[in-house]
């Protein structure tokens, strides 16, 4: 049953809450068999995904999986939003689900909402910070 299709392992509704000013690595886990595909990141603007051309990216290779990483050095408030990775392989374009970054601005960190407030007010754009932690609702 082992398929040699390229797979991008970003789950639907995946989210990260991060703090402005911190470094952050957004990972796109990629499975491929022989030739590594060309992978890019884009940021969603409405229904359009705008390719991130001049951002620092890197590959991390592990035994059964590779990661195409988008680096935030550091995270800025306007990095808030949804991102998608795409792989080009043998003329096929494979797109991942989007993953959302919720950026808390350090300037308002002292006024950040509590966990309880967050639970009762999920519409808040800026989330309480848990570095590298995934939130799912």
């Amino acid at each position: 049953k082992e398929s040699c299709d390229v797979q991008l392992y970003i789950k639907r509704q995946s989210e990260h809450s991060i703090l402005a000013g911190d470094p952050f690595e957004l990972e796109c886990p990629v499975k491929y068999c022989a030739n590594r595909p060309h992978v890019t990141w884009c940021k969603l603007n409405g229904t359009t995904c705008v390719k991130l051309e001049d951002r620092q990216t890197s590959w991390k290779e592990e035994k059964n999986i590779s990661f195409f990483i988008l680096h935030f050095e550091p995270v800025l408030p306007n990095d808030n939003g949804s991102y998608r990775c795409s792989a080009n392989f043998q003329s096929n374009l494979i797109e991942s689900h989007s993953t959302t970054l919720y950026v808390t601005d350090v300037k308002s960190a002292s006024e950040r909402p509590s966990k309880d407030e967050m639970a009762s007010r999920p519409w808040l754009l800026y989330r309480h910070h848990h570095h590298h932690h995934h939130h799912h609702h």
């Epitope: 049953k1 398929s3 299709d5 797979q7 991008l8 392992y9 789950k11 639907r12 509704q13 995946s14 886990p29 499975k31 059964n64 999986i65 998608r84 374009l93 494979i94 797109e95 991942s96 689900h97 989007s98 995934h134 799912h136």
Partner: antibody, heavy 121, light 112 residues
């Protein structure tokens, strides 16, 4: 060979908590893309998805039952456990666990044999 | 929730003849990633479900090629080109595009 097998009580009383275990072999739940779901089927009725746990311990629940459900995994034992609180006779069903494989998204490619749970006093 | 509606609910078929089952969803199953997460299961009498087709038309391993899937958006079809005795059972479509994942009510295929 991939197999999944459900185990747990066949009879529970109303208001009690149901604990079901899915023991699987032939794959690892730590592998990217892998997951396990619980799905139930009341007698003579259609299937209803309950909960899913992913390779990285991320979880998803059916919102209509979320407050009653927990799902956990023990990768070393190849087990996934579902608990459902406050059982009611309408929860009488065959409960299946299924492997979630991945092709851009989860699909269920292997199913357990199912275990019939009756809720009655 | 996305409601999946199958028709017919009962399908008497003649051995060796084709059969077709329709599945309609209340929302488009085309995902923003460009894929359509519509799947089909077979449940033979007294057995647990078995995966037949995923991503609208991909046959799962070990599934005979007399089965095929087609469709897009909200309208999907499962076809059996020549029904065999072992095809008797209930067929379910289900969607994995929107949470919660939801199933059709099932179509019972029986031999005339």
């Amino acid at each position: 060979q991939i197999t999944l097998k459900e185990s747990g009580p066949t009879l529970v009383k109303p208001t009690q908590t149901l604990t079901l275990t899915c023991t699987f072999s032939g794959f690892s739940l730590s592998t990217f893309g892998m997951g396990v779901s619980w799905i139930r089927q009341p007698p003579g009725k259609a299937l209803e998805w309950l909960a899913h746990i992913y390779w990285d311990d991320d979880k998803r629940f059916n919102p209509s039952l979320k407050s009653r459900l927990t799902i956990t995994k023990d990768t070393s034992k190849n087990q996934v456990v579902l608990t459902m609180t406050n059982m009611d006779p309408v929860d009488t069903a065959t409960y299946y666990c299924a492997r979630g494989n991945w092709d851009g998204e989860t699909y269920f490619d292997y199913w357990g044999q199912g275990t019939l749970v009756t809720v009655s006093s | 929730d996305v409601v999946m509606t199958q028709s017919p609910l009962s399908l008497p078929v003649t051995l060796g003849q084709p059969a077709s089952i329709s599945c309609k969803s209340t929302q488009s199953l085309l995902d923003s990633d460009g894929k359509t997460y519509l799947n089909w299961l077979q449940q033979r009498p007294g057995q647990s479900p078995r995966s037949l087709i995923y991503l609208v038309s991909k046959l799962d391993s070990g599934v005979p090629d007399r089965f095929s899937g087609s469709g897009s958006g909200t309208d999907f079809t499962l076809k059996i080109s020549r029904v065999e005795a072992e095809d008797v059972g209930v067929y379910y479509c289900w969607q994995g595009t929107h949470f919660p994942w939801t199933f059709g009510q099932g179509t019972k295929v029986e031999i005339k």
